[in-house]
Amino acid sequence: PALPEDGGSGAFPPGHFKDPKRLYCKNGGFFLRIHPDGRVDGVREKSDPHIKLQLQAEERGVVSIKGVCANRYLAMKEDGRLLASKCVTDECFFFERLESNNYNTYRSRKYTSWYVALKRTGQYKLGSKTGPGQKAILFLPMSAKS
């Protein structure tokens, strides 16, 4: 079952893959979606195959986020855009932190003050416009087993 208390990958050793997840954003109830063409957005459809994500621990507390169907990795670009790349680069790693409200945040390891975030409309939010305390940066990892 989809257990919201089942966190991400931060507590697991490097290289460890957990079951696929759906990342539910507190801001509007959108699931983070990675398209095969590299676009990133949010959708309120649990059945969308592109919301199934593989979180892999690179090191303790650092994860990459791969769209299972898209076979692409979430990346934060230097201008704050979110997109998904075919190959893992240094822009594809995020500090995963469990917040006190049981939601996770995903902060770019390269651009350390920028977070993965979704607007209330389901579009991604530019990293440069994100910050601590925003609802847009809060994600609840949920099981996405098929």
Epitope: P1, A2, P4, Y24, K26, G29, L140, S146
Partner: antibody, heavy 121, light 107 residues
Framework: EVHLQQSGPELVKPGASVKMSCKAS????????INWVKQKPGQGLEWIGY????????KYNEKFKGKATLTSDKSSSTAYMELSSLTSEDSAVYYC??????????????WGQGTSVTVSS | SIVMTQTPKFLLVSAGDRVTMTCKAS??????VGWYQQKPGQSPKLLIY???NRYSGVPDRFTGSGYGTDFTFTISTVQAEDLAVYFC?????????FGGGTKLEIK
């Protein structure tokens, strides 16, 4: 405490339209979508669609497209459903229901008391 | 649309009995099934979400289980106040759909 107060019963003639309301209190209205559900007498439940009060965007069950129009008014924390070209098939109780959000995701955790619509000449 | 087939339609039980009802989805809906209770003359109330999680304040005699296409709802010890119709609902595929309901009657 979350409360959804729906408007009173309606007796309407075939071919007419009706607009019912659902006033929300006890939570931030724009944070959660409002679903609408139909229940014919002694029967099951049918999901009509939802309206997101944040941007007044609605999603519909295909079956109810052209029949139901969902809207909301942020200033009064009220959601509305208008039903058009009414027939006897539209006689039912209509519920508004707030989605749970968070760990409850899209489950409907608070319901209005229902608005009864009777279509009769 | 996903069809949720709920069985049985009626259950006649005595207080203290254990009752089980089932819901079968026409295709896999992951764990995204809720169970609602509707007492006579009242609105539905959420009891179980995401297949097996009890909603806040719901007594622990109510449990849900299942994954994929087959879901079960159990009341471990029926009480007189449990007289109601119980509905399952999937929110995995749009449009969200409900089962036809199981009417629980107490002898």
């Amino acid at each position: 405490e979350v409360h959804l107060q729906q408007s009173g019963p309606e007796l309407v003639k075939p071919g007419a339209s009706v607009k019912m309301s659902c006033k929300a209190s006890g939570y931030t209205f724009t944070n959660y979508v409002i679903n609408w559900v139909k229940q014919k007498p002694g029967q099951g439940l049918e999901w009509i669609g939802y309206n997101d009060p944040y941007n007044d965007v609605s999603k519909y069950n295909e079956k109810f497209k052209g029949k139901a129009t969902l809207t909301s008014d942020k200033s009064s924390s009220t959601a509305y459903m208008e039903l058009s070209s009414l027939t006897s098939e539209d006689s039912a109780v209509y519920y508004c229901a707030k989605e749970g959000g968070g760990k409850y995701v899209y489950a409907m955790d608070s319901w209005g008391q229902g608005t009864s619509v009777t279509v009769s000449s | 649309s996903i069809v949720m087939t709920q069985t049985p339609k009626f259950l006649l039980v005595s207080a203290g009995d254990r009752v089980t009802m089932t819901c079968k989805a026409s295709q896999s809906v992951s764990s995204d099934v809720g169970w609602y209770q509707q007492k006579p003359g009242q609105s539905p109330k959420l009891l179980i979400y995401s297949g097996s999680n009890r909603y806040s304040g719901v007594p622990d005699r109510f449990t849900g289980s299942g994954y994929g296409t087959d879901f079960t709802f159990t009341i471990s010890t029926v009480q007189a106040e449990d007289l109601a119709v119980y509905f399952c609902q999937q929110d995995y595929y749009s449009p969200w759909t409900f089962g036809g309901g199981t009417k629980l009657e107490i002898k």
